[in-house]
């Protein structure tokens, strides 16, 4: 699977993580920081 960084217009899309673009699937994906989950790394897990 080819992966690139998301374009700059996606800055802030991932609240607690890094935005990556899955080229083959044409989908953006957030790689969350440790302790976070959710589509946009929006949830801290207790």
């Amino acid at each position: 699977v080819q992966i690139t960084k998301c374009s700059s217009d996606m800055d802030g899309y991932c609240l607690h993580g890094q935005c990556i673009y899955l080229v083959d699937m044409r989908e953006k994906f957030c790689r969350c920081e440790v302790g976070y989950t959710g589509l946009r790394c929006e949830h801290f897990f207790l």
Epitope: H16, T37, G38, L39, H43, F44
Partner: antibody
Framework: QVQLQQSGPELVKPGASVKISCKAS????????INWVKQRPGQGLEWIGW????????YYNPKFKGKATLTVDKSSSTAYMLLSSLTSEDSAFYFC???????????WGQGTLVTVSA | DVLMTQTPLSLPVSLGDQASISCRSS???????????LEWYLQKPGQSPKLLIY???NRFSGVPDRFSGSGSGTDFTLKISRVEAEDLGVYYC?????????FGGGTKLEIK
């Protein structure tokens, strides 16, 4: 309009498994979480977990890890919940509910009653 | 997990009265965005829960203005200014800030 249509009631034996469904319509299926909520007869609501349909991400309430397994079929815009090793404690209504990122449960399914009995 | 404690368990009211339900979280449910994802739902017998209030004080579309939500940090309140027959049922608070999400135990609003 957004609709979540759940499968019908299930009567299952202890130790067995059951798979219930929640068919979504009226919105883009891959644009919201499908959550599942348990309600034992006469009792309160318990949150089981959520699944984001694409790319698939799941999160389970630790209490339900190993009991519930959430999956989706994107082609039919349907979410599923498999409940395994059933006991009488699993007899309950199960609701699916749609939730966008950091948004409330604005839409709910009608509920599926699962009865576990020998 | 965040424990959501609702009081009272049962609330007998006369039609036209004001009703107040309290919900307390065991820890702060303020999100890193600064928002508080505290919601209120009403479940009538034999029905699915229905959204009333989200983000502490925002009424969902179609919800009458006699319903209001308030609070901050760990203490939240749902008020119904003039109770009508259609308001009877079980009210649940809910937090969606951290995972796992949790519901309060419910408050049954019933006729005195």
């Amino acid at each position: 309009q957004v609709q979540l249509q759940q499968s019908g009631p299930e009567l299952v034996k202890p130790g067995a498994s059951v798979k219930i469904s929640c068919k979504a319509s009226g919105y883009t299926f891959t644009d919201a979480y499908i959550n599942w909520v348990k309600q034992r007869p006469g009792q309160g609501l318990e949150w089981i977990g959520w699944i984001w349909p694409g790319p698939v991400i799941t999160y389970y309430n630790p209490k339900f890890k190993g009991k519930a397994t959430l999956t989706v079929d994107k082609s039919s815009s349907t979410a599923y919940m498999l409940l395994s090793s059933l006991t009488s404690e699993d007899s309950a209504f199960y609701f699916c509910a749609r939730r966008e990122v950091l948004s409330p449960f604005a839409y709910w399914g009608q509920g599926t009653l699962v009865t576990v009995s020998a | 997990d965040v424990l959501m404690t609702q009081t009272p368990l049962s609330l007998p009211v006369s039609l036209g009265d004001q009703a107040s339900i309290s919900c307390r979280s065991s820890q702060s449910i303020v999100h890193s965005t600064g928002n508080t994802y505290l919601e209120w739902y009403l479940q009538k017998p034999g029905q699915s829960p229905k959204l009333l209030i989200y983000k502490v004080s925002n009424r969902f579309s179609g919800v009458p203005d006699r319903f209001s939500g308030s609070g901050s940090g760990t203490d939240f309140t749902l008020k119904i200014s003039r109770v009508e027959a259609e308001d009877l049922g079980v009210y649940y608070c809910f937090h969606g800030t951290h995972v796992p999400y949790t519901f309060g135990g419910g408050t049954k609003l019933e006729i005195k």
